[in-house]
């Protein structure tokens, strides 16, 4: 039978009445243009909604916008457009919400052609009040807050100036001209690239990378011949042009650009690209594009310095620069990532890793599913997940995979079951163990969201017709109830719940359309009365993550340790609550070969835990450039996975010798770097 239709599905008692009492409709008196929604702060209940509408006139487009504010998680909204003097707000800049619970909001206004600069509206009290500020420049990008101090803002101007404010946008100072890209680093540091000759585009590959640690009082040039740069975890990356040709290489720094090392990654040509797929303080996943217009490349994983890389996954699907990749960090379980590969026959298949890129496998076939037409063998196939690439290809996939750190083990995604991703209408699948096993959860495409740290899953069918029904489950997607939230169906445009999945409120957004009226409408449903009581100790059960063989002493060991979690029983209908904290008990494991990545010059054949030498490097000395000195690596092929906490057990030999030889990588060596002050 279809999921949710089993006899043992216990119905939640009197849920219709309970939900009806907690369903709040708000009709926005706006023509249907665009609507954007932002949460201001965490657990504040404050939502800002900006509706914009472009009125086409004969010569130009005239825009109007309205701003609404809710302070009860979307149950009621107040029109606060007058607080911003009924000004048209530019949607391409969005609403710049300050970090953490600063309560800061910046809105960028549309100004008339001849004006000297732009205009912003600033609030530091969760949008209760706004201050209008006229800028001495026209902004090119949204205001960027320093992660460490929300009073510090930076912005690029349309003239390529880098502007900084130290008092939350009240006063602005241009600290540098000819800037292409600027980013906040740690400790209020700003990194930016500059051009010398014509423009950012013309100087690509000849840009300079600069750093200021004092908001523009002094500067240090930390790189030349720069193509682009990026920050990930504690790593600063720069792609640098080679001296002799048009290839680029990645250089990495872990000290804010004072010293650099060349990453042991292939160089790329003009038409190729590098992409940081994921990074934390331990390591980085780097995608290196293949030559030619192949649409794929290779994933490499770094050591703890971001310098030595191991090949992690071949034929990784990633279309052109800035294009689409399905690479997804499964945040509900440590070490798990999902992505897609492009097979030799051009079909797309999903792969999963449970050990941070050490080994990739196909997803296990869901037990309640049949193999589809893509499968050669009707009994043997796997689950393939639809993500960004499928969405970009306009397949019937309304949402990317979803996981939440506080909903342990839960992953929800659209997929198909066969030998490859199918273009047929997908179904929704759920895993409750971080991607090891899967079950079909809902027939056909749906929008979905997680509430109350996994205590409730909400879904809405993806349909071109107006809808008025929402589905919800209190047992991690096994059984579903349907609730008609309005008599008059609406054209559905999106589900919104507070980021972090701790809320019990869900907002359904859409519009009503008749010949002479077209209005945005939201329905906010509070599930608090469905989960009537707070969860108690008896509602939780112990769960060992990454468990595949309970008989094995090392069962559950991933990255050198295992974790036991307290998880809500599926049968318990209770509130985890907003203050819920994931309870976990870690224990260290003995080291095995699984705790080591293949070292530079080695790779791991599929379905093998041993690392073997790369044929092209057999018999060669393994030498690489580190901090401007040549190093010689003595290894039997293994290095500990960054972040791996194992102790004892297997201990492969690894030694790095300083060859006392100078080596440079056409990059500025530390002693040649210059500084200047304003």
């Amino acid at each position: 039978s279809a999921p949710g239709e089993d006899e043992e599905c216990g119905r939640v008692r009197d849920f219709v009445a309970k939900l009806a009492n907690n369903t709040h409709q708000h009709v926005f008196d706006d023509l249907r243009g665009s609507v954007s929604l932002s949460w201001v702060g965490d657990s504040t209940g404050v939502i800002l909604v900006l509706t914009t509408f472009h009125v086409p006139l004969v010569i130009m487009t005239f825009g109007q916008s309205k701003l609404y504010r809710s302070e009860d998680y979307g149950k009621n909204f107040k029109d606060i457009t007058d607080l911003i003097n009924n000004t048209f707000i530019r949607t391409e800049f969005g609403m710049a919400i300050g970090p953490e619970n600063s309560g800061k909001v910046v809105l960028t206004a549309e100004v008339s052609g001849g004006s000297r600069g732009g205009r912003i509206f600033r609030s530091s009290d969760f949008a209760k009040n706004f201050v209008q500020t006229d800028l001495p420049f026209h902004p090119l990008t949204q205001m960027m807050y320093s992660p460490q101090n929300s009073d510090y803002l930076l912005a690029l101007s349309t003239e390529n100036g880098l502007w900084v404010s130290k008092n939350f946008g009240g006063k602005w100072e241009e600290i540098h001209k000819a800037v292409c890209l600027a980013k906040w680093g740690s400790d209020n540091t700003i990194f930016f690239t500059t051009y010398a000759n014509g423009s950012c585009k013309a100087d690509l590959g000849a840009l300079e990378l600069w750093r200021t640690s004092d908001l523009g009082k002094s500067f240090k040039t930390i790189g030349v011949k720069i193509y682009s740069f990026g920050l990930g975890g504690r790593f600063l990356f720069a792609s640098v042009m080679a001296d002799k040709d048009t290839t680029r290489r990645i250089h990495v720094s872990t000290d804010q650009g004072d010293t650099w090392s060349m990453a042991q990654l292939p160089s790329v040509g003009q038409e190729q690209f590098y992409s940081i797929l994921a990074a934390n303080d331990d390591m980085v996943f780097m995608h290196v594009d293949e030559p030619g217009d192949t649409g794929f490349g290779t994933i490499f994983t770094s050591d703890d310095r971001g310098i030595v890389y191991s090949k992690s996954l071949d034929r990784h699907l990633y279309t052109t620069t800035g294009g689409e990749t399905d690479f997804t960090n499964v945040t509900s379980l440590r070490g798990v990532y999902i992505t897609s590969v492009l097979s030799e026959d051009n079909s797309i298949q999903t792969m999963i890793t449970f050990d941070q890129g050490g080994r990739w496998t196909h997803l296990r076939k869901p037990e309640n599913s049949e193999c589809d037409a893509t499968a050669k063998n009707k009994n043997e196939c796997s689950l393939h997940i639809h993500a960004s690439y499928s969405i970009s290809q306009k397949l019937n996939v309304p949402m990317a995979p979803l996981s939440e750190p506080n909903a342990v083990g839960i992953v929800i995604a659209h997929g198909s079951v066969g030998d490859a991703i199918s273009v047929m209408v997908p179904d929704v699948y759920i895993s409750d163990d971080g991607g090891y096993s899967w079950t079909k959860m809902l027939e056909g495409p749906h929008y979905y969201t997680i509430l109350d740290s996994g205590g409730i899953i909400v879904a809405i069918e993806h349909s071109s017709r107006p809808i008025n029904v929402i589905k919800f489950s209190t047992d991690e997607g096994q059984c579903w109830q349907t609730y008609t939230f309005t008599r008059d169906p609406i054209y559905f445009t999106g589900l919104a719940s507070e980021p972090g999945a701790r809320s019990m409120n869900i907002s359904i957004w859409g519009f009503t359309e008749s010949f002479l009226t077209s209005q945005w409408v939201s329905y906010t449903i509070d599930f608090k009365d469905i989960l009537e009581r707070n969860c108690e100790e008896k509602d939780y059960t112990i769960w060992l993550a990454h468990s595949t063989d309970p008989e094995d002493y090392e069962d559950g060991c991933i990255l050198g340790y295992k974790e036991q979690f307290l998880r809500l029983r599926k049968s318990s209908v209770c509130q985890n609550g907003r203050d819920y904290v994931v309870t976990k008990q870690p224990s260290i494991c003995l080291c095995s070969l699984e705790d080591f990545l293949c070292d530079f010059g080695y790779y791991r054949p599929e379905n093998d835990s041993k690392c073997v030498e790369q044929p092209e490097l057999k018999g060669h000395d393994l030498e690489f450039c580190l901090y401007g000195r040549e190093e010689h690596l003595t290894t039997n092929g293994y290095r500990k996975i960054p972040g791996d906490k194992c102790q004892g057990g297997v201990n492969p030999v690894r030694e790095v010798k300083d060859l006392k030889k100078k080596c440079t990588s056409n990059f500025l060596s530390p002693e040649k770097q210059n500084s200047k002050s304003n």
Epitope: L31, V55, L57, V58, F515, L516, S518
Partner: antibody
């Protein structure tokens, strides 16, 4: 100043179809509604349906559902009304009219601009 | 659909008379009502929108009132140019017109 210019008179046989065009000159449709209204000889005004060109959505009066198709081409600022399975009682003057909508930034202000009308005669 | 009933269907009046035409909706339409004037062989012309707002360029002798289900068009002092047929039109959802009122010379 927006003007709505309609296509010329038509004579059709019963069972045939007719397609009348309505071009906005001196401005664009924007998100106005375009209504089609007909008037049989000596009779009152009858709303057939309408479209919002910016959204591409059309609405029809119950009486004409299934027999009328209203479309619009925003790029040429032209709306079209096609009536099929014509009968003698469809003989009328067909008007297009621009209409402000009721919500948001368009204040409802009735059908403020009308086309000159297109006479359609259905006769065997 | 909402039905609009206009009365009278014909009205005889003289120049200078105060003329009142009424329109009744089969259900409440708030203020979503317009009034039009039509002369033979011509397209209708908008006079009043949103029950009581005067369209620009329309003489001030024309006025509209009412809300809900009962509406009135008043011509305070009938002029020679005002002899025509008048239609009310509701705009609450789909559009419907009243049957029309012909104002003729007495």
């Amino acid at each position: 100043q927006v003007q709505l210019v309609q296509s010329g008179a038509e004579v059709k046989k019963p069972g045939a179809s007719v397609k009348v065009s309505c071009k906005a000159s001196g401005g664009t449709f924007g998100s106005y509604a375009i209504s089609w209204v007909r008037q049989a000889p000596g009779q009152g005004l009858e709303w057939m349906g309408g479209i919002i060109p910016a959204f591409g959505t059309a609405w029809y009066a119950q009486k004409f559902q299934g027999r009328v198709t209203i479309t619009a081409d925003e790029s040429t600022s032209t709306a079209y009304m096609e009536l099929s399975s014509l009968r003698s009682e469809d003989t009328a003057v067909y008007y297009c009219a621009r209409q402000g909508r009721k919500t948001g930034y368009y204040y409802y202000y009735g059908m403020d601009v009308w086309g000159q009308g297109t006479t359609v005669t259905v006769s065997s | 659909d909402i039905q609009m009933t206009q009365s009278p269907s014909t009205l005889s009046a003289s120049v200078g008379d105060r003329v009142t035409i009424t329109c009744r909706a089969s259900q409440s339409i708030s203020s979503w009502l317009a009034w039009y004037q039509q002369k033979p062989g011509k397209a209708p012309k908008l006079l009043i929108y949103k029950a009581s707002s005067l369209e620009s360029g329309v003489p001030s002798r024309f006025s509209g009132s009412g809300s809900g289900t009962e509406f009135t068009l008043t011509i305070s002092s009938l002029q020679p140019d005002d002899f025509a047929t008048y239609y009310c039109q509701q705009a609450d959802g789909h559009i419907t017109f009243g049957g029309g009122t012909k104002v003729e010379i007495k």
